[in-house]
């Protein structure tokens, strides 16, 4: 993974488009699209004033934690779908794409150095806990995925890529 590949806005746009497509196919889908349990996902709301005042390292922690939790949530969704009696094929395809996309984003963020930035404070337990919400449908899960990409992830990469250019 070239270190600055994620700094090309088209790369993030590709994953965002996939997430939006996934969200769209679940619109109005009730029968096949329930998760049948509440899955914890990151709260994608961003306080822009607080975000701008954050050190890039703290932003990296938030993004890395969010990405890890979102990945875990989509993996859980994938497992629930596999274990369901009749998985809806279009949904299965988009869930698989989301897992793959999140893995690629993990690799791209790693290459950018997000993992190095996201070192723990001296007392790891003092790290601010990630704010979370729950998703009970695939639609909500995909909406969180697309909101995370266009929110914290886009903000972080914008800042990290700009910092790296200096």
């Amino acid at each position: 993974a070239p270190p600055r590949l994620i700094c090309d806005s088209r790369v993030l746009e590709r994953y965002l488009l996939e997430a939006k497509e996934a969200e769209n196919i679940t619109t109005g889908c009730a029968e096949h699209c329930s998760l049948n349990e509440n899955i914890t996902v990151p709260d994608t709301k961003v306080n822009f004033y607080a975000w701008k005042r954050m050190e890039v390292g703290q932003q990296a922690v938030e993004v890395w934690q969010g990405l890890a939790l979102l990945s875990e949530a989509v993996l859980r969704g994938q497992a629930l779908l596999v274990n369901s009696s009749q998985p809806w094929e279009p949904l299965q395809l988009h869930v698989d794409k989301a897992v793959s996309g999140l893995r690629s984003l993990t690799t791209l963020l790693r290459a950018l150095g997000a993992q190095k930035e996201a070192i723990s404070p001296p007392d790891a337990a003092s790290a601010a806990p990630l704010r979370t919400i729950t998703a009970d449908t695939f639609r909500k899960l995909f909406r969180v995925y697309s909101n995370f990409l266009r929110g914290k992830l886009k903000l972080y990469t914008g800042e990290a890529c700009r910092t790296g250019d200096r």
């Epitope: 875990e72 893995r103 790693r110 990630l130």
Partner: antibody
């Protein structure tokens, strides 16, 4: 720097239980998963299971289901692996390893804990 | 479960030789494959992730390629310190599985 430090060697009798600890430092513990991998003497690597340090969610290898439990204590950044009803073929070096999100590559490993099961 | 078949199980080569190890998955695993090096009495060490990405700090003589079911790990110029056992590992699906390992020795 990132470190995973495991508890010391154990000798157990068949039928007993063992609990191995793995203390993490140098990173935000809840951002990564902890995997457990074992290696019998002279053999290859066998994945035992994964534990989310954030949510506590787990996924265990089918052959160990019902005998293994993986837990964490986030206040001390420590992961635990308990294996019950030990048999002689459980004799192995047990490793904890850090994994990233849905990308299960293990970039840091503990030093290993030798568990010997013998009557 | 996805089976990972690694070959050869052992090999002996001279310092400076090009060494190639292959790993075959029993089903398509995309690029969700990693390579580890394990020296006697030590924990494994990540060398390559996502089939072809070199882990930070790993010498560039190590490389990986492949996608789908067939993967290759290469040491372009074998060094004495490369004596170890090398494992591939898939993470396309649970349970995660490792290849049987390839023991590399110096002639």
């Amino acid at each position: 720097q990132v470190q995973l430090v495991q508890s010391g060697a154990e000798v157990k009798k068949p039928g007993a239980s063992v609990k191995v600890s793995c203390k993490a430092s140098g990173y935000t513990f809840t951002t990564y998963g902890i995997n457990w991998v074992r290696q019998a003497p002279g053999q290859g690597l066998e994945w035992m299971g994964w534990l989310s340090a954030y949510s506590g969610n787990t996924n265990y290898a089918q052959k160990l289901q019902g005998r293994v439990t993986m837990t964490t204590d986030t206040s001390t950044s420590t992961a635990y692996m308990e294996l019950r009803s030990l048999r002689s073929d459980d004799t192995a070096v047990y490793y904890c390893a850090r994994g990233v999100g849905a990308s299960f590559y293990f970039d840091y490993w503990g030093q290993g804990t030798l568990v010997t099961v013998s009557s | 479960d996805i089976q990972m078949t690694q070959s050869p199980s052992s090999l002996s080569a001279s310092v400076g030789d090009r060494v190639t190890i292959t790993c075959q998955a029993s089903q398509d695993i995309s690029n969700f494959l990693n390579w580890y090096q394990q020296k006697p009495g030590k924990a494994p060490k990540l060398l390559i992730y996502d089939a072809s990405n070199l882990e930070t700090g790993v010498p560039s003589r190590f490389s990986g390629s492949g996608s789908g079911t067939d993967f290759t790990f290469t040491i372009s110029s074998l060094q004495p310190e490369d004596v170890a056992t090398y494992y591939c590992q898939q993470y396309d699906n649970f349970p995660l599985t490792f290849g049987g390992g390839t023991k590399v020795e110096i002639k």
